[in-house]
């Protein structure tokens, strides 16, 4: 019986010779559990596992802890890959995180973190980031040191408010912090002075809700 080839991330898929961007099946480390992900094989050398994407507001990102844990949406469009998978993947190997952003005026920018990982669920999928470079701000729009993840039904922020309910979407809220890429999607000309939009402060400032975002990870030794 031939053993099925499994891949833990899009970098392994790329190195296997499959170099076309699209949806692929990934397998949890040390498990048979599978998840479908979008692999970007074109951006900056390829091999990127997309863990978040926003582009048109077609998917509701005001979801529960369980939904953010397991993932939701469609890898061909707007989606969240899942905190549990990303946590397991990044805890066993050194990954970089690239965040690609688009505004409504036709500009693009990115933030690249040279080391990214999520703690496990027992630590509320706390985000850990070091080594910021890129064009989307010299200061990290994800609060440092990293915050715990919060959702509408699991409030783990440092605010007297409930950031996830106030700003919408699950995110690594501080109190509430300079970013929220899972906020409410606003169309062009309705995207300024928003208290709950898709925010990356150190690129576009406060109240500006972005047109598109992609968060993607790749092994640092790719």
């Amino acid at each position: 019986k031939e053993e099925k080839t499994t891949f833990r991330d899009c970098a392994e898929i790329f190195k296997s010779g499959l170099t076309t961007s699209g949806i692929y099946t990934l397998t949890f480390p040390n498990s048979t559990e599978e998840v479908k992900a979008y692999c970007d094989m074109d951006m900056g050398g390829g091999g990127w596992t997309v863990i978040q994407h926003r582009e048109d507001g077609s998917v509701d990102f005001q979801r529960t802890w369980k939904e953010y844990k397991e993932g939701f949406g469609s890898p061909l469009g707007e989606y969240w890959l899942g905190n549990e998978f990303v946590s397991q993947l990044t805890s066993g190997h050194r990954y970089v995180l690239k965040i690609q952003l688009k505004d409504w005026e036709g500009s693009e920018a990115h933030s690249l973190y040279e080391h990214f990982y999520l703690s496990g669920e027992e630590s509320n999928y706390r985000i850990h980031l070091t080594g910021l470079t890129g064009t989307a701000g010299k200061i990290s729009s994800i609060s440092q040191p990293g915050s715990d993840f919060s959702t509408k039904d699991s409030d783990n922020d440092k605010c007297i408010c409930k950031c996830s309910q106030m700003l919408t979407g699950g995110w690594w809220f501080d109190a509430c912090g300079p970013s929220n890429l899972n906020g409410q999607y606003y169309p062009q000309k309705q995207n300024t002075n928003k208290f709950n939009g898709i925010k990356w402060y150190y690129w576009k400032g406060s109240g500006y809700s972005l047109k598109a975002t992609t968060m993607m990870i790749r092994p640092a030794d790719f």
């Epitope: 440092k158 605010c159 007297i160 408010c161 109190a175 509430c176 928003k194 208290f195 406060s206 109240g207």
Partner: nanobody, 129 residues
Framework: EVQLVESGGGLVQPGGSLRLSCAVS????????IGWFRQAPGKEREGVSA????????YYADSVKGRFTISSDNSKNTVYLQMNSLRPEDTAVYYC??????????????????????WGQGTLVTVSS
């Protein structure tokens, strides 16, 4: 739609006074804190003063304490900044901005600039003889 409109700026001599107004629409002042910020040419935008109407609490930057007074008129949904004893270094574009009053870190009294998500277009204050 949230809108903030500043007015009252202008040219004033050192030692003079001005009163800036920030007319707010689309939100009620009871639920928000309103801050005044300023930005001089080539410098970072900095916080000047802020007010939470619901609790009546106020904040002032050290550089304006004793000279500037912030107040609000909830019936007019307007916040004012009375500026006395003006100095050349007060020259800047002055902006008002809004933040939900509850968006506060445990143990803190005021808000970092990135929490203010709604901004006006600004009004220019020039202090010169």
């Amino acid at each position: 739609e949230v809108q903030l409109v500043e007015s009252g700026g202008g040219l004033v001599q050192p030692g003079g006074s001005l009163r800036l107004s920030c007319a707010v629409s689309g939100i009620t002042l009871d639920d928000y804190a309103i801050g005044w910020f300023r930005q001089a040419p080539g410098k970072e935008r900095e916080g000047v003063s802020a007010i939470r109407s619901s609790g009546g609490s106020t904040y002032y930057a050290d550089s304006v304490k004793g000279r500037f007074t912030i107040s609000s008129d909830n019936s007019k949904n307007t916040v004012y900044l009375q500026m006395n004893s003006l100095r050349p270094e007060d020259t800047a574009v002055y902006y008002c901005a809004a933040v939900p009053a509850g968006r506060l870190r445990y143990g803190e009294q005021w808000y970092p600039i990135y929490e203010y998500d709604a901004w006006g277009q600004g009004t220019l204050v020039t202090v010169s003889s």
